[in-house]
C-alpha cells in the first residue's frame, strides 16, 4: 500500500479509536481533560488532567528508519492498547502529559525518541511522502 494511503488509513482509524474511547471514558466537549487527537504524526487517546499517555513510535519512523528495531509493543489497531506495557526508558516511546492547559508537547520529541539518521536520509528522498 502507498505510504500516503497508510497514513490516511491511520488517521481515519485514529478518529474511530478516539470516538470509542470518548464513549468508554464518558468524555464530551465540556469534560475536563485533554481530547484525543491526531497530531499529523500519531494518535493520542483522550486523557484526564494529570495523566501521562505513552505511545510507541509511529509508522512514519518505520519509513524514515527501516532498519530501526524497537523493543516496545505496537499499539493495537482496534483500541489504544495498554499504555502500561510501555516505558519511557525504552527507545521508541513518546509521551504527552495532559495538563490543565491541555496537551504538553511530545517527550522526548519524535526524532529523539524514535531515532533519525539525517545523513542516511539524504539519499532516500524519492521515497519520501507528505502526510496530508
Amino acid at each position: 500500500m502507498h505510504s500516503d494511503c497508510i497514513f490516511k488509513k491511520e488517521q481515519a482509524m485514529c478518529l474511530e479509536k478516539i470516538q470509542r474511547a470518548n464513549e468508554l471514558m464518558g468524555f464530551n466537549d465540556s469534560s475536563p481533560g485533554c481530547p484525543g487527537m491526531w497530531d499529523n504524526i500519531t494518535c493520542w487517546k483522550p486523557a484526564h488532567v494529570g495523566e501521562m499517555v505513552l505511545v510507541s513510535c509511529p509508522e512514519l519512523f518505520r519509513i524514515f528508519n527501516p532498519d530501526q528495531v524497537w523493543e516496545t509493543e505496537t499499539i493495537g489497531e482496534s483500541d489504544f492498547g495498554d499504555s502500561n506495557s510501555l516505558d519511557l526508558s525504552d527507545m521508541g516511546v513518546v509521551s504527552r502529559n495532559c495538563t490543565e492547559d491541555g496537551w504538553s508537547e511530545p517527550f522526548p520529541h519524535y526524532f529523539d525518541a524514535c531515532g533519525f539518521d539525517e545523513y542516511e536520509s539524504e539519499t532516500g528522498d524519492q521515497d519520501y511522502y507528505y502526510l496530508s
Epitope: P106, S121, E122, D125, Y128, L131
Partner: antibody, heavy 120, light 107 residues
Amino acid sequence: QVQLVESGGGVVQPGRSLRLSCAASGFTFSRFAMHWVRQAPGKGLEWVAVISYDGGNKYYAESVKGRFTISRDNSKNTLYLQMNSLRAEDTALFYCARGYDVLTGYPDYWGQGTLVTVSS
Amino acid sequence: EIVLTQSPATLSLSPGERATLSCRASQSVGRSLHWYQQKPGQAPRLLIKYASQSLSGIPARFSGSGSGTDFTLTISSLEPEDFAVYYCHQSSMLPFTFGPGTKVDIK
C-alpha cells in the same frame, strides 16, 4: 553542513507588511520542523513561531498571533514569515532555526538573522 | 504560557572558576529544557538538550541538571571563550519560551 540564510529584513513603517525568507541547505529540509525566533536590540530571545515538516501544524507566540504567518516551500528548501500590521515593538533581529523534530522540536541550528526595523 | 526565570542576571567570574546558572519554570516542563550560549554578534548555539544531555562538539566542562521546575547549567572551569549570555528554553508546552538570559562576564 547545515546552513540557514535569512533575508527580507529592512526598515518598514508601522502598520505595513514584510516577508522574511530563510534558505536552507545541508540537510533534508522537508523532514524537519522550522522555527522563527527574534531578538530585540540588546534584549533576550523570543520564540515567534514553528511549522511542522509538511506545513500541517503551525503554532505562534501570543504576541504575533493573527498578524504573522509562518509557511514553507519544501520544493525550494525555503521557510517564510509573513509579517502584517507591524508595530514598533516588532523591531528585532529575526532568526530562523531548524527544529530537531518533525512536529516542533527545539532549535538546534540557527541562521545569522535578518534585521527588521519598524519605524515611522 | 510557561515563564522561565534565570538567575543571576549577571555572573562576574574569573577564568578557571566554576559557574552555576539557574533556570526556574513557572510550571513543570519535565525534562524538556534546553540551554543555549550566545556570544555578541553571533547566533545562539545549542549546548545541552533535555536538561542534562550533552551534545557532540560541546566541551565536557558544560553540564546540566534538574527536572520539573528547577534546572542548573554548570561550567566546571571557565575558559576565556565561555564569557557569553546563556539562555534556557522550554519545549514542553506551546507557546515555547526562553528565559531572559544570564550574562557571564569577566570579573
